[in-house]
Interface confidence: low
């Protein structure tokens, strides 16, 4: 084969958002017949030559960016996309509210507001079932997530987290869930 080996995938199971003291497994997946895997934590000297890292109890020190690669013969693959492993529950949960309210007519507007009592400048909003968050660096203790022209697809359960840009992988506990109901669809 000419050129670099294709990059592997790196995933965290069951999730890359891991409550403190809960287990998580990091799994590097390359093509069949790989000779050697290397899984490393960036900005540290921590690495292992195995495809799977099982963390029985999440700690603050394990939060951060990870990547992996593999070796076939003398060739190393391109590195995987970075995985951000986040420790949650480090700080008290924020509150999540909907303005003007959690019931909104289809086509209307609603703003989800994540608010914390402490000095955080970063917020992440998750919709249950969606793996990717809406991230919003706004005011240091409150972020607003406007949803313009609401549709039925916006219905669902939302949670938010707060954290500091100083320690971007140490997050609060999740807010209590907020159920957004879209009416008139």
């Amino acid at each position: 084969q000419s050129g670099p080996l294709p990059k592997p995938s790196l995933q965290a199971l069951p999730s890359s958002l891991v409550p403190l003291e809960k287990p998580v497994t990091l799994r590097c997946q390359g093509p069949p017949g790989v000779d050697l895997y290397r899984l490393e934590k960036l900005s540290s000297s921590r690495y292992q030559d195995q495809a799977v890292l099982f963390i029985p109890a999440m700690k603050r020190s394990l939060a951060g960016r990870y990547r992996c690669s593999y070796q076939n013969g003398s060739l190393w693959s391109l590195p995987s996309d970075q995985l951000e492993l986040v420790a949650t529950g480090v700080f008290a949960k924020p509150s999540l509210s909907a303005q003007p309210g959690p019931a909104v007519s289809s086509g209307g507007d609603v703003t989800l507001q994540c608010q914390t009592r402490y000095g955080f400048d970063q917020f992440a909003l998750y919709k249950e079932g969606d793996p990717a968050p809406y991230k919003n660096p706004e005011r240091w203790y409150r972020a607003s997530f406007p949803i313009i022209t609401v549709t039925a697809a916006h219905s669902g359960t939302y949670r938010c987290y707060s954290f500091s840009s100083r320690d971007p992988y140490l997050w609060s506990a999740p807010s209590d869930p907020l159920e957004l109901v879209v009416t008139g669809t």
Epitope: S97, Q113, Q115, R117, Y118, G119, R139
Partner: antibody
Framework: EVQLLESGPGLVAPSGSLSITCTVS????????VNWVRQPPGKGLEWLGM???????DYQSTLKSRLSISKDNSKSQVFLKMNSLRTDDTARYYC????????WGLGTSVTVSS | DIQMTQSPSSLSASVGGRVTITCKAS??????IAWYQHKPGKGPSLLIH???TLQPGVPSRFSGSGSGRDYSFSISNLQPEDIATYYC????????FGGGTKLEIK
Amino acid sequence: EVQLLESGPGLVAPSGSLSITCTVSGFSLTGYGVNWVRQPPGKGLEWLGMIWGDGSTDYQSTLKSRLSISKDNSKSQVFLKMNSLRTDDTARYYCARDLPMDYWGLGTSVTVSS
Amino acid sequence: DIQMTQSPSSLSASVGGRVTITCKASQDINKYIAWYQHKPGKGPSLLIHYTSTLQPGVPSRFSGSGSGRDYSFSISNLQPEDIATYYCLQYANLLTFGGGTKLEIK
């Protein structure tokens, strides 16, 4: 224009209770928090507590047992209640918007004396 | 609760000069510090938040810096209208004011 206006009783008897109202305009109490701060004569500023947009409250730990903050969003009013007053509660009481308190009222003077 | 130790408690400087006030927190406050100017008969005015961010309309003569537990606030090219008491405020965990610094002009 954002404005906050405090109104209070002026004079309160020792061991009595204090009620102060902060009436705001130019912003909604559902979207912003309001703090209470006081300044005793010749002394510095002291944060008392805060009510958030969602109605939750935080209090300075040493005053928590004597302090209550509430609000009426529809009237754009925030209320400070303090009981078991002592002479050292004599101060100018201010309300201020949000974190880190970008708008303030002019304050209302409270004297605790018999 | 986080304690804020502000110094000096008073200072005197000449017009056109420069003054610096410091605040030390009892624990790391992650840059969540604000600075206020307070003149008699008025409510305090927010000058700086998040260590160094100037409020709109505040002259660039005012500045702030710091990290961790140690923070400072400076006024350069001092003007007569800067006579006031200045306070730091931490808002990393609840809120705590420093004791204040009374600024006088020589």
